[in-house]
C-alpha cells in the first residue's frame, strides 16, 4: 500500500471528511478526471488540481498535528505527478507563484504573450517532433 | 498571421511592456517552457501558465480600453490550448475557481484525495490503453 | 481556563460592514487556533470561520466565504471578523471560541456572544 493511503485517511479524520454530507453536490475532482481520457487532457487538469492540493497544504501548515501526514501526501504527489523530477517541480511551483497584482509580473507576462500562444497548440511541434511524426506514418503506411 | 498577435501588441502599449527594462531578471514562461520537450510535461506546464493569463485578464476587465484585445487573446487561447472543446474549458475553469479557504470544498478535497493520488501517475492507466502499448511494443519489436 | 470576551455587533442594513472582535485572556493565545461560529433563532449553532494559532490555516462556511474576513493579533490577544456586503441571512448571536488542539473546528471554549442583525 502507498505511504499516502494512510495518511490520507488521518487527515480524513481531521477535516471530518468521512462524513456522508461530504458528498453533497457532487464532487470537484473526481467527475472533471472522469471526463478526460487523453494524456495531455489529463495532464492539463491535474496540473489544476495538484496545485490545488499544494496551496491547500500551504494553508494548513500551521497545524502540527497533520504535518507528518502532509509532508508524506506531499512527497508521494512529488514521486507520482513530477516522476520524483526535482527541476519539474521547481519549475511547476515557480509557475503557481507568480502574483497576478504584481506591475512586474504583468508587464512580463504581457511581453511574452506572443511567444507563449505561438507554442500553445500541439501542432506548434519542434521541427524534429514533426519529422519523426513523419517518418512514424510512413513506416505504419508501408507496413 | 493569427488575430492575438495584433491584440497582443496592444496590451504591450498599454502596459509599457515593450520597454528594454522588462527583460530584467529573466523570463517568467518562456525559460521554464525551453526545459520541457515532452507534450505532457508541457500540458502540465502550459496548464499553470493559461490560469495565469486568465487570472491577468480577469483583473483587467474594469479597463475598457483594452477588452477588445482580452476578449480576442481568451478566444484565441481557448482554440489553440482547449481545441475550441467547451467541456474542456469549462472543467478547467472549474478547478480554477474552487476556494482554498472554502471548509466544504476543503473536505471534499480531502475525501477525494486517494482517488486522485491513484489517477496521478501515467502508470495508472485503463486495461485497455496498458494493452495497446504492449500490442505497439510487440509489433515494434517485430519489425 | 480561558476567558473571550466579543464586541462589535449591532444593527445594520443590507450590504453594510461590521467588524466582530473578541479578546481572549488566561491562556496563552498564539498556541491556539481560534473560531467565529453564530446561531440564528430557533437554528443550531454553525462554524463561520476558523484561524490557526499564526494566522494561517483558514477555513470559511461556504455561506460567509468572500465576504467574511477572519484575521487574529497575536500581540493583541484578539481575533477578528471582518463581515462585508452583510445579509440579512447573516442575522445571529456570533460567538469566539478556542478550538481544541489537534481538531479543525472543535471548540473548548466561548464567549458569550454578540448580536448582529442586518435589517433588509
Known amino acids: 500500500q502507498d505511504p499516502y493511503v494512510k495518511e490520507a485517511e488521518n487527515l480524513k479524520k481531521y477535516f471530518n471528511a468521512g462524513h456522508s454530507d461530504v458528498a453533497d453536490n457532487g464532487t470537484l475532482f473526481l467527475g472533471i478526471l472522469k471526463n478526460w481520457k487523453e494524456e495531455s487532457d489529463r495532464k492539463i487538469m491535474q496540473s489544476q488540481i495538484v496545485s490545488f492540493y499544494f496551496k491547500l497544504f500551504k494553508n494548513f501548515k500551521d497545524d502540527q498535528s497533520i504535518q507528518k501526514s502532509v509532508e508524506t501526501i506531499k512527497e508521494d504527489m512529488n514521486v507520482k505527478f513530477f516522476n520524483s523530477n526535482k527541476k519539474k517541480r521547481d519549475d511547476f511551483e515557480k509557475l503557481t507563484n507568480y502574483s497576478v497584482t504584481d506591475l512586474n509580473v504583468q508587464r512580463k507576462a504581457i511581453h511574452e504573450l506572443i511567444q507563449v500562444m505561438a507554442e500553445l497548440s500541439p501542432a506548434a511541434k519542434t521541427g524534429k517532433r514533426k519529422r519523426s511524426q513523419m517518418l512514424f506514418r510512413g513506416r505504419r503506411a508501408s507496413q | 498571421q493569427d488575430p492575438y498577435v495584433k491584440e497582443a501588441e496592444n496590451l504591450k502599449k498599454y502596459f509599457n511592456a515593450g520597454h528594454s527594462d522588462v527583460a530584467d531578471n529573466g523570463t517568467l514562461f518562456l525559460g521554464i517552457l525551453k526545459n520541457w520537450k515532452e507534450e505532457s510535461d508541457r500540458k502540465i506546464m502550459q496548464s499553470q501558465i493559461v490560469s495565469f493569463y486568465f487570472k491577468l485578464f480577469k483583473n483587467f476587465k474594469d479597463d475598457q480600453s483594452i477588452q477588445k484585445s482580452v476578449e480576442t487573446i481568451k478566444e484565441d487561447m481557448n482554440v489553440k490550448f482547449f481545441n475550441s472543446n467547451k467541456k474542456k474549458r469549462d472543467d478547467f475553469e472549474k478547478l480554477t475557481n474552487y476556494s482554498v479557504t472554502d471548509l466544504n470544498v476543503q473536505r471534499k478535497a480531502i475525501h477525494e484525495l486517494i482517488q486522485v493520488m491513484a489517477e496521478l501517475s501515467p502508470a495508472a492507466k485503463t486495461g485497455k490503453r496498458k494493452r495497446s502499448q504492449m500490442l505497439f511494443r510487440g509489433r515494434r519489436a517485430s519489425q | 481556563a480561558v476567558q473571550l470576551v466579543e464586541s462589535g455587533g449591532g444593527l445594520v442594513q443590507t450590504g453594510d460592514s461590521l467588524r466582530l472582535s473578541c479578546v481572549a485572556s488566561?491562556?496563552?493565545?498564539?498556541?491556539?487556533?481560534m473560531g467565529w461560529f453564530r446561531q440564528a433563532p430557533g437554528k443550531e449553532r454553525e462554524f463561520v470561520a476558523r484561524?490557526?494559532?499564526?494566522?494561517?490555516?483558514?477555513s470559511y462556511a461556504t455561506s460567509v466565504e468572500g465576504r467574511f474576513a477572519i484575521s487574529r493579533d497575536n500581540a493583541k490577544n484578539t481575533v477578528y471578523l471582518q463581515m462585508n456586503s452583510l445579509k440579512p441571512e447573516d442575522t445571529a448571536v456570533y460567538y469566539c471560541?478556542?478550538?481544541?488542539?489537534?481538531?479543525?473546528?472543535?471548540?473548548?471554549?466561548w464567549g458569550q456572544g454578540t448580536q448582529v442583525t442586518v435589517s433588509s
Open positions: 488566561g491562556g496563552t493565545f498564539s498556541r491556539y487556533a
Open positions: 471560541a478556542s478550538l481544541v488542539s489537534g481538531t479543525l473546528y472543535q471548540a473548548d471554549y
Open positions: 484561524i490557526g494559532y499564526s494566522g494561517r490555516s483558514i
